[in-house]
Amino acid sequence: EPPTACREKQYLINSQCCSLCQPGQKLVSDCTEFTETECLPCGESEFLDTWNRETHCHQHKYCDPNLGLRVQQKGTSETDTICTCEEGWHCTSEACESCVLHRSCSPGFGVKQIATGVSDTICEPCPVGFFSNVSSAFEKCHPWTSCETKDLVVQQAGTNKTDVVCGPQDRLR
């Protein structure tokens, strides 16, 4: 009796079970009662990442430098190329099809997490006792200067954007 279902890594065609092509190979011809499935390796810059019956391999992804992309991991006959972004840029999506410049944290905000090739800068407001007076993708909030440790006194209070201003203590006459 002809089969109605096939084993894993097989497919049903013309009332018989044929072996799927292994990752890295494409289908040339279906099996017969006399021959096995005929498969051929994918060409240069092509891949197939599953057991398959595809007659064409997929093209490796192109990491377009004009979009700020570069190759993170070169593709093989079984895997696609993985793109990432140039230094200072990050992917706009999980597929990493284009890049945008890392965001800078404005004065009053510090970097909580530095951006990576796949995630943007995460900023946080500088809490009391900390400040940031620059727009930066790297600088964290800095603590206000401790005037006391320098034997000085606060002459001007700090804010989230400015450091305290220290000055000499008033002399007792």
Epitope: V28, C31, T32, E33, F34, T35, E36, E38
Partner: antibody, heavy 117, light 107 residues
Framework: EVKLVESGGGLVKPGASLKLSCAAS????????ISWVRQTSDKRLEWVAS????????YYPDNVKGRFTISRENAKNTLYLQMSSLKSEDTALYYC??????????WGQGTSVTVSS | DIVLTQSPVTLSVTPGDSVSLSCRAS??????LHWYQQKSHESPRLLIK???QSISGIPSRFSGSGSGTDFTLSINSVETEDFGIYFC?????????FGAGTKLELK
């Protein structure tokens, strides 16, 4: 017991035709593909033709394509090989062989074909 | 076409010897190879399928190995009834092709 019996061989002149038969028994004939394989005097084996279980698909090597025709009558449990435009290089012992799991798992005893002027 | 090259052409052995017969394919055929034995004045018979799978009724001294392009048929302790010609056959693609055979003979 699986049995394949070839017949129809003989001596013919170049350009002539000949029809070989293969009578099958001991298994469900209509469930199996069958092939013809020939063996030359130097003992080399050469695949000649194959036909699917239902008879809807046939396969030939280039050197016999257009000259040989494989066919089957499932109701009669019989396989045929119609050979035409025979050449001296077709001289051989012709076997029919059953295809089981893509292997030629049972062979007949062969029938001899000689093409000579 | 896939060409199968068998070696040696002839192998002269004494019963009790263990032997290895080689079959090399001109291109990769995975494990899509069968072995046949043909004794004098007999039809070929299937010995090993899919390069290494045993066949019911075939003595366990026969074994097959290999994948890709290089295949081996091994006979562990040859018996007198083993003399004859051994053929490999590929079924990876059309046309089906056979090796020219290795003749196993008595030394």
């Amino acid at each position: 017991e699986v049995k394949l019996v070839e017949s129809g061989g003989g001596l013919v002149k170049p350009g002539a035709s000949l029809k070989l038969s293969c009578a099958a028994s001991g298994f469900t004939f209509s469930n199996y593909g069958i092939s013809w394989v020939r063996q030359t005097s130097d003992k080399r084996l050469e695949w000649v033709a194959s036909i699917s279980s239902g008879g809807d698909n046939t396969y030939y090597p280039d050197n016999v394509k257009g000259r040989f025709t494989i066919s089957r009558e499932n109701a009669k449990n019989t396989l045929y090989l119609q050979m035409s435009s025979l050449k001296s290089e077709d001289t051989a012992l012709y076997y029919c062989a059953r295809a089981g799991e893509k292997a030629m798992d049972y062979w007949g005893q062969g029938t001899s074909v000689t093409v000579s002027s | 076409d896939i060409v199968l090259t068998q070696s040696p052409v002839t192998l002269s052995v004494t019963p009790g010897d263990s032997v290895s017969l080689s079959c090399r394919a001109s291109q990769t055929i995975n494990n899509n190879l069968h072995w046949y034995q043909q004794k004098s004045h007999e039809s070929p018979r299937l010995l090993i399928k899919y390069a290494s799978q045993s066949i019911s009724g075939i003595p366990s001294r026969f074994s097959g190995s290999g994948s890709g392009t290089d295949f081996t048929l091994s006979i562990n302790s040859v018996e007198t009834e083993d003399f004859g010609i051994y053929f490999c056959q590929q079924f990876s693609s059309w046309p089906l092709t056979f090796g020219a055979g290795t003749k196993l003979e008595l030394k």
